[in-house]
Interface confidence: low
């Protein structure tokens, strides 16, 4: 068998909401993957498991099952959404994400994704990790790959 290539493209969109009382930020982060099947037979994308970390803490997890199949020598682009919550000991980020006098509300998130594919009863797992910048101050739609190169402003302590 030839390889199945998984390429994490980046953040497609991030939609933000807030809980005033709990000083909590909710970020729904939609990511894009390119999965390429270099074989002369179809493969099934059985599941995608993803998690997002902020400051070494897991803030969101997602799992998609029975996603799609990819034909021979074909590529499919797959979007998946991870709901994340920045709260509790990270509630200091709340001011940072919502102040107008801060123009750039980008935070650094670690995106981890594992794709499980199957063909002829054989299962294969491919994992990727990538640091991405996400704006926690407003709803944002990114050009694909753009969130990798944004400037990030860390809050002043």
């Amino acid at each position: 068998p030839r390889s199945i290539d998984v390429k994490y493209i980046g953040v497609k969109s991030a939609y933000v909401s807030y809980d005033v009382q709990k000083r909590t930020i909710y970020l729904n982060i939609t990511n894009t993957l390119n999965i390429t099947n270099n074989n002369y037979y179809s493969v099934e994308v059985e599941n995608i498991t993803a998690q997002v970390q902020f400051a070494k803490t897991v803030i969101g997890k997602a799992r998609l099952n029975n996603i799609t199949h990819i034909g021979p020598l074909d590529m499919k682009q797959i979007d998946y959404t991870v709901p994340t919550v920045i709260a509790e000991e990270m509630s200091y980020m709340y001011d940072f994400c919502t102040l107008i006098s801060i123009k750039v509300h980008n935070i650094v998130l670690m995106m981890q994704v594992t794709v499980t594919t199957t063909y002829f009863g054989h299962s294969e797992q491919i994992s990727q990790e990538r640091y991405q910048y996400v704006d926690c101050g407003r709803n944002t739609t990114y050009q694909l790959g753009q969130s990798e190169y944004l400037n990030v402003l860390q809050p002043q302590q």
Epitope: Y18, V20, Q21, R23, Y94, D95, F96, C97, T98, L99, I100, S101, I102, K103, L153, P155, Q156
Partner: antibody, heavy 118, light 112 residues
Framework: QVQLQQPGAELVKFGASVKLSCKAS????????MHWVKQRPGQGLEWIGN????????HYSQKFKDKATLTVDRSSNTAYIQLSSLTSEDSAVYYC???????????WGQGTTVTVSS | DIVMTQASPSVSVTPGESVSISCRSS???????????LYWFLQRPGRSPRLLIY???NLASGVPDRFSGSGSGTAFTLRISRVEAEDVGVYYC?????????FGSGTKLEMK
């Protein structure tokens, strides 16, 4: 220690322009917004606008959009306000003040008194 | 634009007593993050303004705890307990929730 140094006074002719300076020291100039505030004799404070020295982004009060231009010189850690087409209404004390991302308007200059003479 | 109103141009107080200075905003200064973006400043005669209170109720560094700020989204109060001679001057509120930022017209504190 943090200081915002402004010249004490400027005497300018009616219809002319003037560029006032505010030299910052004792902190990282590009990490704080610089604001400009006007106070006419015996009157209250008016917010003119602010500038982010790191990239020169500005915000102005509508009233001062055609009157004031805010700039910075990062090499000398100095903020400037240029006032154009001066009239007697522009005779006032002009203060600079800094504010951080966490919003404390904690340091002010001593103010420059602008007198417009005909 | 947000309009800040200080209805009392002046207040008179006996040293040692308490006094309250009020300020209103034309719309709520309560942000989605739970903070209320209102400053109080004191300008003594012939001096630059000095920050007293930030985010409605937080005491600025070096300010005596005789000063306190309170309020709702649109109505705010600066309270000075045990007023001293050095407290005379003009007190200004200022909103910084939205551009353009704006000041109230000021309230002059005088001694009886």
């Amino acid at each position: 220690q943090v200081q915002l140094q402004q010249p004490g006074a400027e005497l300018v002719k009616f219809g002319a322009s003037v560029k006032l300076s505010c030299k910052a020291s004792g902190y990282t100039f590009t990490s704080f917004w610089m604001h400009w505030v006007k106070q006419r004799p015996g009157q209250g404070l008016e917010w003119i606008g602010n500038i982010d020295p790191s990239d020169s982004e500005t915000h102005y009060s509508q009233k001062f959009k055609d009157k004031a231009t805010l700039t910075v010189d990062r090499s000398s850690n100095t903020a400037y306000i240029q006032l154009s087409s001066l009239t007697s209404e522009d005779s006032a004390v002009y203060y600079c003040a800094r504010s951080s991302n966490w919003d404390n308007f904690d340091y002010w200059g001593q103010g420059t008194t602008v007198t417009v003479s005909s | 634009d947000i309009v800040m109103t200080q209805a009392s141009p002046s207040v008179s107080v006996t040293p040692g007593e308490s006094v309250s200075i009020s300020c209103r905003s034309s719309q709520s200064l309560l942000h989605v993050n739970g903070n209320t973006y209102l400053y109080w400043f004191l300008q003594r005669p012939g001096r630059s303004p000095r920050l007293l209170i930030y985010r409605m109720s937080n005491l600025a560094s070096g300010v005596p705890d005789r000063f306190s700020g309170s309020g709702s989204g649109t109505a705010f109060t600066l309270r000075i307990s045990r007023v001293e001679a050095e407290d005379v001057g003009v007190y200004y509120c200022m909103q910084h929730l939205q551009y353009p930022f704006s000041f109230g017209s000021g309230t002059k504190l005088e001694m009886k």
